[in-house]
Amino acid sequence: GLNDIFEAQKIEWHEGSHHHHHHHHGSGSLVPRGSGSVPRWRQQWSGPGTTKRFPETVLARCVKYTEIHPEMRHVDCQSVWDAFKGAFISKHPCNITEEDYQPLMKLGTQTVPCNKILLWSRIKDLAHQFTQVQRDMFTLEDTLLGYLADDLTWCGEFNTSKINYQSCPDWRKDCSNNPVSVFWKTVSRRFAEAACDVVHVMLNGSRSKIFDKNSTFGSVEVHNLQPEKVQTLEAWVIHGGREDSRDLCQDPTIKELESIISKRNIQFSCKNIYRPDKFLQCVKNPEDSSCTSEI
């Protein structure tokens, strides 16, 4: 199984995302839109606007998800879209709350095996490649709600039913309580709360901060793992360089993570993944001779 794959890569064992954080409200700037003698004003934010075809994409992804996952075919995708829309339409995009998303959370309720959860920070693509091969493990984006919103941006305007395709609040420059940030905070918290037994997290060893307290993982998920359910958090530090044989589990930010986790009465372990390409190959073909012997 996975242990053999780790062994074969000489992975060191040590016992022991979506980006957000900071709180300030921005007012944005007002710019005229439309033509004619009476100007109509639209809020101008610092971030990119709502993804084009946003309503169509969310609805299509929902139906596609239920096609891919027959166990979710009871979901009414029109109701899901209505609840999603209701969370941010006609609301000030700097004043969104977790409460706004509760109807959507309720409709998107899904049971994933609580001991098969893979969290990630700043290394989404590899995490998704891994769960594509290791089909019994799940990232947040493998759940309905994560799948719906992955890589999308959205926001509305106070008191109008319009979606803002021009600009949306930037988390740093404008405000943290924007529709996208609050969505990911809400679903990430719920996902972490659901986890049990051994929880895995994939971290990017090429970043200056391998563990970043300001990432969604560092600011939300770490603090919402339930010590009464979660026995161990196991970090997989993914190396970027071909010849990088350093033990990144000794990195100060990993030690910081270990300290936070230990204080929460959860055990911590860490593994280096020196060759992510080989790691994935061995997950695909564990019987391969190079995956069962030391290399």
Epitope: R53, E56, T57, A60, R61, V63, K64, E67, I68, P70, H128, Q132
Partner: antibody, heavy 120, light 107 residues
Framework: EVQLQQSGPEVGRPGSSVKISCKAS????????MHWVKQSPGQGLEWIGW????????DYAEKFKKKATLTADTSSSTAYIQLSSLASEDTATYFC?????????????WGQGTLVTVSS | DIQMTQSPASLSASLGETVTIECRAS??????LAWYQQKPGNSPQLLIY???SLADGVPSRFSASGSGTQFSLKINSLRSEDVASYFC?????????FGAGTKLELK
């Protein structure tokens, strides 16, 4: 109008590989998963697998896991199936197919089929 | 995997006659069943989805019923253009599976 246009017939030698294409038009390619179905001469239909073009995610029937590889190119709205290590039992017509989202999950749209003949 | 058993394998009928084809699933598939018609040299065409709903453009002489494990397709007032093979398919679970088909010929 939704159309799935498949590439022409292929002849492959035993042990070699072939790659068939299915070009989609009349809809947003990433909004639907694409299925592939095999029909051996004079035989029934066998589901091979699906691909989600938006993410490149795939799923295969156990029987086809080592035989077929599904890929998609969103820039050209084209799905592909590659058949490897060809053997006589791979001689068949291969179809791409898509649901309509309004017709349950039955396949409302089909490509015209591509005949693959394995011959030495 | 869910097995789909279709009967009869072939059948001859006269114009104007009513024809029934049966399909049995090896486990409960609720109403997650489609019926297809395939004429020689053509792709299959969706006739029925969700066990009993008629697909767009399909003549009303085609009807279907059933749920759970027992399903049937009925063709009223058989016409010459109905000569084809008919397949049932379950889409309740992956892998999707098809019946072996029924070849319908004219007497």
């Amino acid at each position: 109008e939704v159309q799935l246009q498949q590439s022409g017939p292929e002849v492959g030698r035993p042990g070699s590989s072939v790659k068939i294409s299915c070009k989609a038009s009349g809809y947003t390619f990433t909004d639907y998963i694409m299925h592939w179905v095999k029909q051996s001469p004079g035989q029934g239909l066998e589901w091979i697998g699906w691909i989600d073009p938006e993410y490149g995610r795939t799923d295969y029937a156990e029987k086809f896991k080592k035989k077929a590889t599904l890929t998609a190119d969103t820039s050209s709205s084209t799905a592909y199936i590659q058949l490897s290590s060809l053997a006589s039992e791979d001689t068949a017509t291969y179809f791409c197919a898509r649901s309509a989202h309004t017709t349950g999950f039955g396949f409302a749209y089909w490509g015209q089929g591509t005949l693959v003949t394995v011959s030495s | 995997d869910i097995q789909m058993t279709q009967s009869p394998a072939s059948l001859s009928a006269s114009l104007g006659e009513t024809v029934t084809i049966e399909c049995r699933a090896s486990e409960d598939i609720y109403s997650n069943l489609a019926w297809y018609q395939q004429k020689p040299g053509n792709s299959p065409q969706l006739l029925i989805y969700d066990a009993n709903s008629l697909a767009d453009g399909v003549p009303s002489r085609f009807s279907a019923s059933g749920s759970g494990t027992q399903f049937s397709l009925k063709i009223n007032s058989l016409r010459s253009e109905d000569v084809a093979s008919y397949f049932c398919q379950q889409y309740n679970n992956y892998p999707y599976t098809f019946g072996a088909g029924t070849k319908l010929e004219l007497k």
